[in-house]
Interface confidence: low
């Protein structure tokens, strides 16, 4: 015997309280697949999160981060503060990269300059806090 709920499309739920008819998901909820017994509550993009895609009856809202922050984690589950190029985020806030390291992005950690001599090359352009060294031809 076919499950009567299998006819309920995405955007509805199979309402057991009402003879298993397909009821529309209430506002601020969604069902992304058919045959569901309940609708899921829409994600709300609040505070440092902002709405990248509105919730619809068939798909959840998608969030990104307000300016000055960037996404971390699957589906932008967290927002992390941006730093300037040449800095990294520590527990005490944004700190300049130590000498010998660089960061060319607003996120992430400072990484060591490339050691040109490991490849038998010389330094063509010195590194900075924002840029890696440029290795030249072998001396």
């Amino acid at each position: 015997l076919q499950d009567p709920c299998s006819n309920c499309p995405a955007g509805t739920f199979c309402d057991n309280n009402r003879n298993q008819i397909c009821s529309p998901c209430p506002p601020n909820s969604f069902s992304s697949a058919g045959g569901q017994r309940t609708c899921d509550i829409c994600r709300q993009c609040k505070g440092v999160f902002r709405t990248r895609k509105e919730c619809s009856s068939t798909s959840n809202a998608e969030c990104d981060c307000t300016p000055g922050f960037h996404c971390l984690g699957a589906g932008c589950s967290m927002c992390e503060q941006d730093c300037k190029q040449g800095q990294e985020l520590t527990k005490k806030g944004c700190k300049d990269c130590c000498f010998g390291t660089f960061n060319d992005q607003k996120r992430g950690i400072c990484r060591p300059w490339t050691n040109c001599s490991l490849d038998g090359k010389s330094v063509l352009v010195n590194g900075t806090k924002e840029r890696d060294v440029v290795c030249g031809p072998s001396p």
Epitope: R18, C22, S57
Partner: antibody
């Protein structure tokens, strides 16, 4: 461009059945629901029923026993059938697209059905 | 069934006026309310969904509000093209039901 167009018989004799077709374009019936709404002359709108993208239906309980909604996704057509028509079924019959949080965002122009002998 | 009542069946207003059309439900409908405009030629258009969300392409002079059983549609700066009949519609419970309509005329 999203469009819905109803086509019906115009005149139906009392106790006979009514068949109206709603032909849609610009979207797929596999992703949108279609509702039927009617309006008797000089009166307000009455919701008749809905067919969901998956083929499930809900009907106005007052008309459920003589109402049937079906569709053919490949031909982009939705069908309204109503039995045992009486003169008070005389109305303009509309089909409308159900979207988002279940509002009717696009309507057809409607087709007038007169029940008379 | 949930009864939707539009207590004013017709009203007359002047161009530029602020007009409010009311709609009440026989029981709470949790903001599950839409507003439609029907022009004299029978053309029906969605104006507002979920009580207060403006449908795309609808002029911002239209707004909706309300909660519980009482809802309203406001036209803030009436234009001649707003001559129409306005209907509320609940989708809280099947069968979905419409109000009786409010016919708006220009003085």
């Amino acid at each position: 461009q999203v469009q819905l167009k109803e086509s019906g018989p115009g005149l139906v004799a009392p106790s006979q059945s009514l068949s109206i077709t709603c032909t849609v374009s610009g979207f797929s019936l596999t992703t949108y629901a279609i509702s039927w709404v009617r309006q008797p002359p000089g009166k307000g709108l009455e919701w008749l029923g809905i067919i969901w993208p998956g083929g499930g239906t809900n009907y106005n309980s007052a008309l459920k026993s003589r109402l049937s909604i079906s569709k053919d996704n490949s031909r982009s057509q939705v069908f309204l059938k109503m039995n045992s028509l009486q003169t008070d079924d005389t109305a303009r019959y509309y089909c409308a697209r159900g979207a988002g949080t279940w509002y009717f965002d696009v309507w057809g122009a409607g087709t007038t059905v007169t029940v008379s002998s | 069934d949930i009864q939707m009542t539009q207590s004013t069946s017709s009203l007359s207003a002047s161009v530029g006026d602020r007009v409010t059309i009311s709609c009440s439900a026989s029981q709470g409908i949790s903001n599950y309310l839409n507003w439609y405009q029907q022009k004299p030629d029978g053309t029906v258009k969605l104006l507002i969904y979920y009580t207060s969300s403006l449908h795309s392409g609808v002029p911002s002079r239209f707004s909706g509000s309300g909660s519980g059983t009482d809802y309203s549609l406001t036209i803030s700066n009436l234009e001649p093209e707003d001559i129409a009949t306005y209907y509320c519609q609940q989708y809280s419970k099947f069968p979905w039901t419409f109000g009786g309509g409010t016919k708006l005329e220009i003085k």
